[in-house]
Amino acid sequence: EAHKSEIAHRYNDLGEQHFKGLVLIAFSQYLQKCSYDEHAKLVQEVTDFAKTCVADESAANCDKSLHTLFGDKLCAIPNLRENYGELADCCTKQEPERNECFLQHKDDNPSLPPFERPEAEAMCTSFKENPTTFMGHYLHEVARRHPYFYAPELLYYAEQYNEILTQCCAEADKESCLTPKLDGVKEKALVSSVRQRMKCSSMQKFGERAFKAWAVARLSQTFPNADFAEITKLATDLTKVNKECCHGDLLECADDRAELAKYMCENQATISSKLQTCCDKPLLKKAHCLSEVEHDTMPADLPAIAADFVEDQEVCKNYAEAKDVFLGTFLYEYSRRHPDYSVSLLLRLAKKYEATLEKCCAEANPPACYGTVLAEFQPLVEEPKNLVKTNCDLYEKLGEYGFQNAILVRYTQKAPQVSTPTLVEAARNLGRVGTKCCTLPEDQRLPCVEDYLSAILNRVCLLHEKTPVSEHVTKCCSGSLVERRPCFSALTVDETYVPKEFKAETFTFHSDICTLPEKEKQIKKQTALAELVKHKPKATAEQLKTVMDDFAQFLDTCCKAADKDTCFSTEGPNLVTRCKDALA
């Protein structure tokens, strides 16, 4: 229904706390360089204005759209052009073009320092002093580094953060209580970020229809007892929620997500038997829980998929009468039977089925033509299954760090022109798939591996889009989202690449490496590994292992030496010489 004042409506629906959090996230995602204090001031002004509209919806400007109100606030920031360059040009436009312009200027890789966690004592002190400001800082710092983070989900992670601090700051050993718990939240939040970015990419590049197909497959796997009409309704609502969040309409997004959670909990009987636990929780936890609820038990009496989609004489007639509905039904029926497949795979199968019908229904004898379509799915199913087996075997053999290194070598060979920091980040993220998925039961591995890899590769594509350097990467990133992962997997050594010349300084290290945390040490070593491959793209695994073992030994020796600096300056050049010889 239409409301006289949109801002008053959202403030009333969401409540002050969530309203302020979402406005802060919105501003931080649009203007990623502004300080917390600058944004906090704007948030307070917007909140005060919302309250005047709640008191009197007819008050001046209360009838304006949220984009107009927020955009006007952002455009009033002093020194906008100095700090943001051409983003300031957005302010010369009218809505809705102005908001589109802001969206286009979101930076997926802002040049901000890594979000450093203060030490436990300091963190607890500032949390106790002012919990609201502390959490505001958290929202601001995450949102500006992840401009497409799913806003209502970020509120959930902030709530988790709050609960952990409340609990751990009361303990004697704050550090050992906080570290593992906050690391867990950070890991989950980072995965959530890349997953949501993938959804927004799908929406931006291929439109609502593509996202809705993704949603139908995912929901059908999770709720195999819901009928097609129910799944379609949920997919339509979920598409609206994601479209709003991806489009920067965070208040509407959070409000509609709450409505969807409410609907699901009120209609458990027609959706799933597994929702009750989630539905007993408060709002943020409830919506989060529903988004990752376990799959319902599949109905026992499902007929073979061939009955309606291959053997039925009416296939082409049904397809002609309502293409999208018929293909949607196919996707629903196939997905509810295969919780063990990835959504990407299910969408590839649906695409194959559609292509088969397009070709066969135009023939004189369609059934003879499409009769073998299910058999033609086999290679499409085998490919990701083999990928999972090969990679999980390798992970089990090498462990996470070794597995990351194997991926780093592989991807540097595929796309040696890509910057080393991007390759290292990608390989480290891709390598985490082992820890995340390979330990799961067999039937959960494939969906976990492939959908996670697809999300990480989407980030690779986004970063590469900014500065395209590799034809291989451009080729894989230009196709449809569901074909990306198979495309990257199929890439081989880039034969067009001219190897980088050997620069001794790239492989020269100093004693400061010894005091770095383990993660930073790994990144330094992985940076060297990528540079080695760029120097010798056709080096064998054996050669690279020899060099890396030598390198690890060198670090170990010098970091234990009494005079570290002397060790690094005398042994370093010897290491460089040995590396050159080993790779010659």
Epitope: Q313, E314, C316, K317, A362, A364, P366, P367
Partner: nanobody, 115 residues
Framework: DVQLVESGGGVVQPGNSLRLSCAAS????????MSWVRQAPGKGLEWVSS????????LYADSVKGRFTISRDNAKTTLYLQMNSLRPEDTATYYC????????SGQGTLVTVSS
């Protein structure tokens, strides 16, 4: 909405000819193969003939081979069945269908062959 409207039926003597038409709308006509099926009084549906979307491929039931010709005009989104040398056993209601469908979409057109 998909619509198939058959016309051209009538009463003819054995050995004579008739041309049936089927006007199609509500779908991408060129993307679909089309068929003619028929139903004799008190009998089940019987496939008669099919044609590919482009019109380049045609198939016929043995019982009509050499006597019937299926064709289409994609510009007019119309399917045809030219029936020559008609026999009493060709008496039936004729329906046009999409793809390999053996169902009645339109109201059909009645062909009666009798002396």
């Amino acid at each position: 909405d998909v619509q198939l409207v058959e016309s051209g039926g009538g009463v003819v003597q054995p050995g004579n000819s008739l041309r049936l038409s089927c006007a199609a709308s509500g779908f991408t006509f060129t993307s679909f193969g089309m068929s003619w099926v028929r139903q004799a009084p008190g009998k089940g549906l019987e496939w008669v003939s099919s044609i590919s979307g482009s019109g380049s491929d045609t198939l016929y039931a043995d019982s009509v081979k050499g006597r019937f010709t299926i064709s289409r005009d994609n510009a007019k989104t119309t399917l045809y069945l030219q029936m020559n040398s008609l026999r009493p056993e060709d008496t039936a209601t004729y329906y046009c269908t999409i793809g390999g469908s053996l169902s009645r979409s339109g109201q059909g057109t009645l062909v009666t062959v009798s002396s």
